[in-house]
Interface confidence: low
Amino acid sequence: VPRWRQQWSGPGTTKRFPETVLARCVKYTEIHPEMRHVDCQSVWDAFKGAFISKHPCNITEEDYQPLMKLGTQTVPCNKILLWSRIKDLAHQFTQVQRDMFTLEDTLLGYLADDLTWCGEFNTSKINYQSCPDWRKDCSNNPVSVFWKTVSRRFAEAACDVVHVMLNGSRSKIFDKNSTFGSVEVHNLQPEKVQTLEAWVIHGGREDSRDLCQDPTIKELESIISKRNIQFSCKNIYRPDKFLQCVKNPEDSSCTSEI
């Protein structure tokens, strides 16, 4: 008789999840010499240990501490790029600008990027059918708690000038409920971070508005200023040209505003 299984509102664990995590770990440690000491089997064991046999609505940051410890990594604290609702462009940017890092350029971020996972209380099974949805089911689910944990640590580590890429095409350019708005903003350390510089990415070809005047950007500025961190904002009117100019800064067309 098949055992009754909890039906959650969100998609189930990504197919071949253990294999994917292990393969990504091996690939990452091969590409990044400073992480060659990492034992990927131990990383997977720690990852698995964070959620297997645990109720998927009762996960805590504490559950992920063994994984955090194994994934400890040195990132230049003044080269951090945060992003909100514009992941692809942020990743394209750090692929070109190799000395800057998003969370997904670190080992732990790379392992989990775009994956879903959850287990079941009191069984060692991975649930491939469904996992809790953050809104409809519970916020303390394995995926949400993981990203909250690594995002908090990443923001805490930042120093000097921190950049954030924001999506100017959305109704809320800065969303207080996003990971950036709810976790990262509040974990930047005022003693280490001098300035948060927002890059607002425009979507429309003919969009010449100053989106730095958007009310949600003003709200972000207010939150940041109250935390004793300076705020600056730049419009990126042409993201395609912006990337091109990062690749080739000598191009004559790159002297004008992007």
Epitope: K69, T72, Q73, T74, V75, C77, N78, R153, F154, E156, A157, C159, D160, Q189, P190, E191, K192, Q194, S225, K226, R227, N228
Partner: antibody, heavy 120, light 111 residues
Framework: QVQLVQSGAEVVKPGASVKMSCKAS????????MHWVKEAPGQRLEWIGY????????NYNQKFQGRATLTADTSASTAYMEISSLRSEDTAVYFC?????????????WGQGTLVTVSS | DIVLTQSPATLSLSPGERATISCRAS??????????MHWYQQKPGQPPRLLIY???SRATGIPARFSGSGSGTDFTLTISPLEPEDFAVYYC?????????FGGGTKLEIK
């Protein structure tokens, strides 16, 4: 050079308040957080909190929230700490301290300390 | 709060000897390669003086006989060889997380 000069010793009664000052010189007062640290006899040093004189923003150790109030007068380059509802365990030397600057979040500069004695 | 436990509480040594003071944190004070642990020296009637910052960097003007090491939860301050002016109280301090906290202190006294 950076200097932090604190006000003189105070003897106060239980239940009263005390306000001490820390005058800064040798740097741009509005650009750095001013921290306060408590040294009570036989106890470990305790961080009370800081004020950012640039905009008056404060950050308190939860333990001192509500009884310690940090303020700053930018025109006089002076930071203040007021402690209310004093009790015997508030008898201590209170230091103001400044960090080394951006990415240097450790106390490089210290005032000479203000001794507060709570006694009836 | 992160609790810092220093040992020993008192250390009795002679000038010329080597002093080793330990500081253990209740949780890791590392963040992306930096150990947010600092060491101070305090003499009677004086404010603390910064010796070592970020676990192992010597502050300006601090002699080379002072060194710091460690990561995660375990940190060490070493003074070698001891000079007569080194006898004082030593504190560790973390600022990885609010509230910033100090160790209980180690009194280094002349034997």
């Amino acid at each position: 050079q950076v200097q932090l000069v604190q006000s003189g010793a105070e003897v106060v009664k239980p239940g009263a308040s005390v306000k001490m000052s820390c005058k800064a010189s040798g740097y741009t007062f509005t650009s750095f957080n001013m921290h306060w640290v408590k040294e009570a006899p036989g106890q470990r040093l305790e961080w009370i909190g800081y004020i950012y004189p640039g905009n008056g923003g404060t950050n308190y150790n939860q333990k001192f929230q509500g009884r310690a109030t940090l303020t700053a007068d930018t025109s006089a380059s002076t930071a203040y700490m007021e402690i209310s509802s004093l009790r015997s365990e508030d008898t201590a030397v209170y230091f103001c301290a400044r960090t080394g600057g951006l990415r240097r979040a450790y106390f490089t500069y210290w005032g000479q300390g203000t001794l507060v004695t709570v006694s009836s | 709060d992160i609790v810092l436990t220093q040992s020993p509480a008192t250390l009795s040594l002679s000038p010329g000897e080597r002093a080793t003071i330990s500081c253990r944190a209740s949780e890791s004070v590392d963040s992306y390669g930096n150990g947010f642990m600092h060491w101070y020296q305090q003499k009677p009637g004086q404010p603390p003086r910064l010796l070592i910052y970020l676990a192992s960097s010597r502050a300006t003007g601090i002699p080379a006989r002072f060194s710091g090491s460690g990561s995660g939860t375990d940190f060490t301050l070493t003074i070698s060889p001891l000079e007569p002016e080194d006898f004082a109280v030593y504190y560790c301090q973390q600022n990885k997380e609010d509230p910033w906290t100090f160790g209980g202190g180690t009194k280094l006294e002349i034997k």
